[in-house]
């Protein structure tokens, strides 16, 4: 189980709810968006496999000063079972490939929707 929302959270949030919340937030920040997200910041690409939430957080946590993804980072914190800090890298990063935050978010979103449809919430 994961806990989202910081001190305001009433209790543990089921993974399916957390995943829905993440999907909805990623849609919010990308809908009809053509301007570069986070001023075109680049992040490490990740393998969209097991451990993806932590890997995604490890990539996005290195983007600073971008309010558009603050809530995404917070939701990912709730979905990742261990503490993640800037500069941390897991084997799930494709270390030789950097992509724009906007593309990273869109790729992540499409994959999360696929997982949700397949009922893979963890």
């Amino acid at each position: 189980l994961t806990c989202l929302g910081g001190f305001a959270s009433p209790g543990p949030v089921p993974p399916s709810t957390a995943l829905r919340e993440l999907i909805e937030e990623l849609v919010n920040i990308t809908q009809n968006q053509k301007a570069p997200l986070c001023n075109g910041s680049m992040v490490w690409s990740i393998n969209l496999t097991a451990g993806m939430y932590c890997a995604a957080l490890e990539s996005l946590i290195n983007v600073s000063g971008c309010s558009a993804i603050y809530r995404t980072q917070r939701i990912l914190h709730g979905l990742c079972p261990h503490k993640v800090s800037a500069g941390q890298f897991s084997s799930l990063h494709v270390r030789d490939t950097k992509i724009e935050v906007a593309q990273f978010v869109k790729d992540l979103l499409l994959h999360l929707k696929k997982l949700f449809r397949e009922g893979q919430f963890n």
Epitope: N32, Q33, K113
Partner: antibody, heavy 126, light 108 residues
Framework: EVQLVESGGGLVKPGGSLRLSCAAS????????MSWVRQAPGKGLEWVGR??????????NYAAPVKGRFTISRDDSKNTLYLQMNSLKTEDTAVYYC?????????????????WGQGTLVTVSS | SYELTQPPSVSVSPGQTARITCSGD??????AYWYQQKSGQAPVLVIY???KRPSGIPERFSGSSSGTMATLTISGAQVEDEADYYC???????????FGGGTKLTVL
């Protein structure tokens, strides 16, 4: 065949209510964001509101003139979109179209595809 | 509330290039969509995401966007292109749609 068919239009008195339906076929309705757009006689197109697909949150947004009076909903099991219109005003008189929402096209499986209904006329008059 | 501004009318001779503009403060960051509507018919999408053309739309239709202005260009306009054209986009949140007032294209 990909199509949308609206129904439920007609004559209603000011202050009255009406529910429009839009039956979808030929595409994966549950993946689509859907919009309602209206056109008053001899006037331009006016965006009424939209509903996201369920997987994208199912959230609704409305244009200022209809917010609080109109409600958009969907029944994916019936491939049907609805527009519940309450507290109708004479200025709501228009042809109402349902359409796939292009902003949501990236998230669905209808990217670059455009589907509109034939429109249904709603007349608000005493 | 957010608005998109279009010229009420544009006239060209057959074979000429017609340009219809659409201005809006959010257009630098939000995509524009263009619809063609002929009398008594439902609108038809002719350009999406600023410059992409749906299948079945003739190549003479193209779109571009720069700053707060989106432009629909019809190269070698034909009589059958005579119609009302509407630009469509969203406010800066992406949550609320808006249409321009429409431009009547006359090809004579």
């Amino acid at each position: 065949e990909v199509q949308l068919v609206e129904s439920g239009g007609g004559l209603v008195k000011p202050g009255g209510s009406l529910r429009l339906s839009c039956a979808a076929s030929g595409f994966t309705f549950s993946n689509a964001w859907m919009s309602w757009v209206r056109q008053a006689p001899g006037k331009g197109l006016e965006w009424v509101g939209r509903i996201r697909s369920e997987i994208d949150g199912g959230t609704t947004n409305y244009a200022a003139p209809v917010k609080g009076r109109f409600t958009i909903s969907r029944d994916d099991s019936k491939n049907t979109l609805y527009l519940q219109m309450n507290s109708l005003k004479t200025e709501d008189t228009a042809v109402y179209y349902c359409a796939t929402d292009q902003v949501g096209a990236y998230y669905g499986d209808y990217y670059g595809m455009d589907v509109w209904g034939q429109g249904t006329l709603v007349t608000v008059s005493s | 509330s957010y608005e998109l501004t279009q010229p009420p009318s544009v006239s060209v001779s057959p074979g000429q290039t017609a340009r219809i503009t659409c201005s809006g403060d959010a257009l630098p960051e939000k995509y524009a969509y263009w619809y063609q509507q002929k009398s008594g018919q439902a609108p038809v999408l002719v350009i999406y995401e600023d410059s992409k053309r749906p299948s079945g739309i003739p190549e003479r239709f193209s779109g571009s966007s720069s700053g707060t202005m989106a432009t629909l260009t019809i190269s070698g306009a034909q009589v059958e292109d005579e119609a009302d054209y509407y630009c469509h986009s969203t406010d800066s949140s992406g949550n609320h749609g808006v249409f321009g007032g429409g431009t009547k294209l006359t090809v004579l």
